[in-house]
């Protein structure tokens, strides 16, 4: 048994960090695989996490955590039995991937004007809270040639849009994703996307 | 109530041994490392030994070391300090104490909270 | 390893007046934002040592809102609001991020 690609990890700076590798063959993940993990910290112990399937040779372990620090580092060691296949070590602050926005939601009953907002995936304790950016893609299902990234560069999780710049009669999708500037992210996963039809027609007198 | 009580301290010759037990109660005992300190006649607390919750991640002084092993047993609630190829200068009131939640990721600290009472080791000829 | 080194070693106080012991690290005991790995313990004469303060500001439980903390990174302060006949003993800072924990020399309080 022999690894692949090694393991890359990634955390989203509160609980979890996701970490994926790739096996030499076809694997059964949780059962013949174990990543475990310790704290490099006075009197931690070590912690296992199983892993799950990614694809035929992919495997993906979710490490339950406590809350990040910038200091914490922690050892990996992979093991198939009695095999040790891998040793690495993580440093969660350097490979942050923030969790995605949540809870989005369109608001069209604001006169000429779309509002989207959405909720940061942050407790306002955590250091992320304060420094998310976003960017919302707009789409159009009926116009495939209409595809809108907006970026949103101040802390509320909010985007007004004159609904006048979207064709009216016909549905849009929007969703969300965020990354957070001084922790040099990557962009976390898309949020679910919601759904909309624009009823909005322009005045008359303005046609 | 959350309690130490420490046991096996006594009068040892230079070269001998002696095995400190220190039983804890009122805590869940395996969730908690625990650590033994020590203070020679008139002088001041010096750290000996600490062990983890699980026993796994053991920690020694370096006037100790290879020469004391520190263990225990969750079963019993016991932590146990055994000290082999004693010196006159081992001699001192040796106190356990609980020490950080260990089961956690991150090990939570609230200081050595809970001490025993204290046992006496006097190695003489 | 990290050295703890307490000032001062004795420390004659009216009651009622405040007292205040002053503990310095060779190393930063910081971890995270507001987590610094220093104690403060007080020995009475005859008894075991008894926790003060843990992670540099926090009161242990029962302990009397006249002893405080304070401090970060290589520095640290334990303060006595106002000093009362029982308070007299050894006060030992101790640093608790890594193995070998050093203590303080101790400093001794006494009434005069």
């Known amino acids: 048994m022999k690894v692949l690609q090694e393991p890359a990890c990634v955390s989203d700076y509160m609980s979890i960090s996701t970490c994926e590798w790739k096996m030499g063959g076809p694997t059964n993940c949780s059962a013949e695989l174990r990543l475990l993990y310790q704290l490099v910290f006075q009197s931690s112990e070590t912690h296992t996490c199983v892993p799950e399937n990614n694809g035929g040779v992919g495997c993906v372990c979710h490490l339950l955590m406590d809350d990040v620090v910038s200091m914490d580092n922690y050892t990996l060691d992979l093991w198939a039995g009695q095999q040790l296949l891998w040793k690495g070590s993580f440093k969660p602050s350097e490979h942050v991937k923030p969790r995605a926005p949540g809870n989005l939601t369109v608001h069209t009953n604001v006169s000429d004007t779309v509002l989207l907002t959405w909720s940061n995936p942050y407790p306002p304790d955590n250091y992320l809270y304060n420094d998310l950016t976003y960017a919302v893609n707009i789409w159009s299902e009926n116009d495939p040639a209409y595809s809108r990234i907006h970026n949103v560069t101040y802390l509320k999780p909010t985007l007004r849009i004159p609904a006048s710049t979207l064709k009216s009669g016909i549905s849009y999708r929007a969703r969300v994703r965020a990354w957070a500037q001084h922790y040099n992210t990557t962009w976390s996963e898309w949020s679910p996307s919601t759904k909309w039809y624009n009823s909005y027609r322009e005045p008359f007198e303005q046609r | 109530e959350v309690q130490l009580v420490e046991s096996g301290g006594g009068l040892e010759q230079p070269g001998g041994s002696l095995r400190l037990s220190c039983a804890g109660s009122g805590f869940t005992f395996r969730d908690f490392a625990m650590t033994w300190v020590r203070q020679a006649p008139g002088k001041g607390l010096e750290w000996v030994s600490s062990?983890?919750?699980?026993?796994?991640?053991?920690y020694y002084a370096d006037s100790v070391k290879g020469r004391f092993t520190i263990s225990r047993d969750n079963s019993k609630n016991t932590l146990y300090l055994q000290m082999n190829s004693l010196r006159a200068e081992d001699t001192a009131v040796y106190y356990c104490a609980k020490d950080r939640l260990s089961v956690t990721v991150r090990p939570r600290y609230y200081g050595l909270d809970v001490w025993g009472q204290g046992t006496t080791v006097t190695v003489s000829s | 390893d990290i050295v703890m080194t307490q000032s001062p070693l004795s420390l004659p106080v009216t009651p009622g007046e405040p007292a205040s012991i002053s503990c310095r690290s060779t190393?930063?005991?910081?971890?995270?934002?507001?987590?610094?790995?220093v104690d403060w313990y007080l020995q009475k004469s005859g008894q075991s040592p008894q926790l003060l303060i843990y992670l540099g500001n926090n009161r242990a439980t029962g302990v009397p809102d006249r002893f405080s903390g304070s401090g970060s990174g290589t520095d640290f302060t334990l303060k006595i609001s106002r000093v009362e006949a029982e308070d007299v003993g050894f006060y030992y800072c101790?640093?608790?991020?890594?193995?070998?924990?050093?203590f303080g020399q101790g400093t001794k309080l006494e009434i005069k």
């Open positions: 190393q930063s005991l910081l971890y995270s934002i507001g987590k610094n790995y």
């Open positions: 101790m640093q608790a991020l890594t193995t070998p924990y050093a």
């Open positions: 062990i983890s919750g699980s026993g796994d991640n053991i």
